[in-house]
């Protein structure tokens, strides 16, 4: 057993038909002595007396809220919440396994630039009684600061039957060095709690291997003359780490039809313009990558060729 | 050149090299980025690598201020991979398959760095850790770390440069 | 399958126009762009020009503008090369090429060969 | 127009060897440029596309590497198929160009 926060504490539990559970002793936080009783949630039934409760606690009807009194006057509470290991290994209930960029990925993450801000999110089915709570540092033996907002209810969508909730929460390393070549990890480390099921999800990676940038801004066509070529220029994000010179992108440009199975026009450049031949009811789109360090490429930003 | 004593390195020659590098040492092992060796454990076989690190002057700033810490950081990590990539974790058994990309990797990083100090001038260099893995499997995922960690030393060196042609050059 | 099948050697005098065809198969005639490669003996390869067979956009290259005519059917998915004003220069094997993807060659004809000798 | 410019112009090497052959674009044409066969009397083969994007078919001994101005194909344990004629492209800008033809030649 170890403690989530004030008077919240987690009991670990090995989950498997007929185990023993844990013993746990609860001591009630005041200094009286006699007359002191013990009951779990709303039930008035009375567990036990004396300023400690020992429990076996082995499954959810065992955790819970349970509350110390003396003569109708509360005196204090401890809420233990169950985390399950089958088989050793953790629980991992309350999330949707995202299965991308592999299997087992609860908690997926993105930076727009190298300024050590980045955004992590995750799924679930579950709508009510469930709350997150996300830490974060550079590096596990000795971390140094990283500050993580509260996570918030970012979208809903309806996959099928089942309703899905996207969680997301926005983080900062304290003291970030955007030039640096990183050698120490992010540690991501979310608490979920849902009802009384307690369970964590960790994910640890280099800010540089989630960049994603924002897609290229302000696009614009410049027909030339006696040709079915036309100029597209476009800008870096806003977003983007400066001074370019610096931080440089690299740019995919393509010319495509509505439907993928078109035929189109593609050319890489690391300018911030590109010639290629337009068609009608075809579409230019641009996207990017950092130029010298391939993560992710942006979505499309793209504008209609006629 | 950049030499010791502190004239300015060929940038523009020095950035098409990084360039170079960077798409070679992805050529080399553009799987790696799927695989996540963290959790491989064994942290100690790639923290002993030279990092290019926040002091080390290689920020727009600090290049501009004064490039030669920057540089000497840098050669530093060129040495030290290029002799990495010629020992026995790359040399010996799983034979790299002959069209293995680090070759071309391993010769590139002699070019920058010799563009960075020519012969004569010394700038000290980090040693090699004796990091000579038994089992073939060891020494596999070895390549990978230390390529994976070679991807993100040239995407910084790669970046001074490209910022020293635009804004350093004579 | 995808094919591309021109049709058979040609023999021209200088000054005389040549008109050589290129049948596909195989796809959709108008969702690949149609080009024209040549070859001439014991050289390298020369890019002509493509064509968008949806629509009849076209383009050349600037060595070949004027005296190069690309055309598609695609009643008969059949795309055309006419070179005209034919010199001893232009004795080659010119070849039909298509892509979904209009600035590299996926599928090739066989080839046709073009001599012109007076 | 973009010159490309290969070499060596033939090469002589045995079956089973690794060959390299390059080819040089006068500016940099990014990741535009894409790698052919040629055997005698035939049409073209596309091999590479986008410097190192493989083609469904083409045997994994074939690949392709470099951005800028510098690009390799590298044939890795040559096959006796292989002896070829081999032509890079670049799709940067219009006219497409081809590099002039590396022969790769039986020893």
């Known amino acids: 057993i170890w403690e989530l926060k004030k008077d919240v504490y987690v009991v670990e539990l090995d989950w498997y038909p007929d185990a023993p559970g844990e013993m746990v002793v609860l001591t009630c936080d005041t200094p009286e002595e006699d007359g002191i009783t013990w009951t779990l949630d709303q039930s008035s039934e009375v567990l036990g007396s004396g300023k400690t409760l020992t429990i076996q606690v082995k499954e959810f009807g065992d955790a819970g809220q349970y509350t110390c009194h003396k003569g109708g006057e509360v005196l204090s509470h401890s809420l233990l919440l169950l985390h399950k290991k089958e088989d050793g290994i953790w629980s991992t209930d309350i999330l949707k396994d995202q299965k991308e960029p592999k299997n087992k990925t609860f908690l997926r993450c993105e930076a727009k630039n190298y300024s050590g801000r980045f955004t992590c999110w995750w799924l679930t089915t579950i709508s009510t009684d469930l709350t997150f709570s996300v830490k974060s540092s550079r590096g596990s033996s000795d971390p140094q600061g990283v500050t993580c907002g509260a996570a918030t209810l970012s979208a809903e969508r309806v996959r099928g039957d089942n309703k899905e909730y996207e969680y997301s929460v926005e983080c900062q390393e304290d003291s970030a060095c955007p030039a640096a070549e990183e050698s120490l990890p992010i540690e991501v480390m979310v608490d979920a709690v849902h009802k009384l099921k307690y369970e964590n999800y960790t994910s640890s990676f280099f800010i540089r291997d989630i960049i994603k940038p924002d897609p290229p801004k302000n696009l614009q066509l410049k027909p030339l003359k006696n040709s079915r070529q036309v100029e597209v220029s476009w800008e870096y994000p806003d977003t983007w780490s400066t001074p370019h010179s610096y931080f440089s992108l690299t740019f995919c440009v393509q010319v495509q039809g509505k439907s993928k199975r078109e035929k189109k026009d593609r050319v890489f450049t690391d300018k911030t313009s590109a010639t290629v031949i337009c068609r009608k009811n075809a579409s230019i789109s641009v996207r990017a990558q950092d130029r010298y360090y391939s993560s992710s490429w942006s979505e499309w930003a793209s504008v209609p060729c006629s | 050149r950049a030499v010791p004593g502190g004239s300015s390195p060929a940038w523009t020659q020095c950035q098409q090299l990084s360039q170079k590098l960077c798409t070679l040492a992805w050529s080399a092992h553009p799987l790696v980025g799927h695989m996540d060796l963290r959790e491989e454990g064994d942290e100690e076989t790639t923290n002993d690598v030279p990092h290019i690190q926040c002091g080390d002057g290689c920020d727009p700033q600090g290049l501009r201020d004064n490039s030669q810490f920057c540089l000497q950081r840098i050669h530093q990590g060129l040495i030290f991979y290029e002799k990495l990539l010629g020992s026995d974790i790359f040399t010996g058994e799983p034979s790299l398959l002959p069209d293995s990309p680090v070759g071309q990797l391993h010769a590139s990083l002699l070019g920058l760095s010799q563009l960075l100090q020519p012969e004569g001038h010394h700038w000290e260099t980090q040693q090699i850790p004796s990091l000579s893995p038994s089992q073939p499997w060891q020494r596999l995922l070895l390549r990978f770390k230390i390529l994976r960690s070679l991807q993100a030393f040239v995407a910084v060196a790669a970046r001074v440069f490209a910022h020293g042609a635009a804004t350093l050059s004579p | 399958e995808v094919q591309l099948v021109q049709s058979g050697a040609e023999v021209k005098k200088p000054g005389a126009t040549v008109k050589i065809s290129c049948k596909a198969s195989?796809?959709?005639?108008?969702?690949?762009?149609l080009h024209w490669v040549r070859q001439r003996p014991g050289k390298g390869l020369e890019w002509m020009g493509w064509?968008?067979?949806?629509?009849?956009?076209?383009e050349y290259a600037p060595k070949f503008q004027g005296r190069v005519t690309i055309t598609a059917d695609t009643s008969t998915d059949t795309g055309y090369l006419e070179l005209s004003s034919l010199r001893s220069e232009d004795t080659a094997v010119y070849y039909c090429?298509?892509?979904?993807?209009?600035?590299?060659?996926?599928?090739w004809g066989q080839g046709t060969l073009v001599t012109v000798s007076s | 127009d973009i010159q490309m410019t290969q070499s060596p112009s033939s090469v002589s090497a045995s079956v089973g060897d690794r060959v390299t052959i390059t080819c040089r674009a006068s500016?940099?044409?990014?990741?535009?440029l894409h790698w052919y066969q040629q055997k005698p009397g035939k049409a073209p083969k596309l091999l590479i596309k986008?410097?190192?994007q493989s083609i469904s078919g083409v045997p994994s001994r074939f690949s392709g590497s470099g951005s800028g101005t510098d690009f390799s194909l590298t044939i890795n344990s040559l096959q006796p198929e292989d002896f070829a004629t081999y032509y890079c492209?670049?799709?940067?800008?219009?006219?497409?160009?081809f590099g002039g033809g590396t022969k790769v030649e039986i020893k």
């Open positions: 500016q940099s044409i990014s990741i535009n």
């Open positions: 064509i968008d067979p949806e629509n009849g956009d076209t």
């Open positions: 492209q670049q799709s940067n800008s219009f006219p497409l160009t």
């Open positions: 090429a298509a892509n979904k993807e209009l600035r590299y060659f996926d599928v």
């Open positions: 195989g796809y959709t005639f108008s969702d690949y762009y």
């Open positions: 986008f410097a190192s």
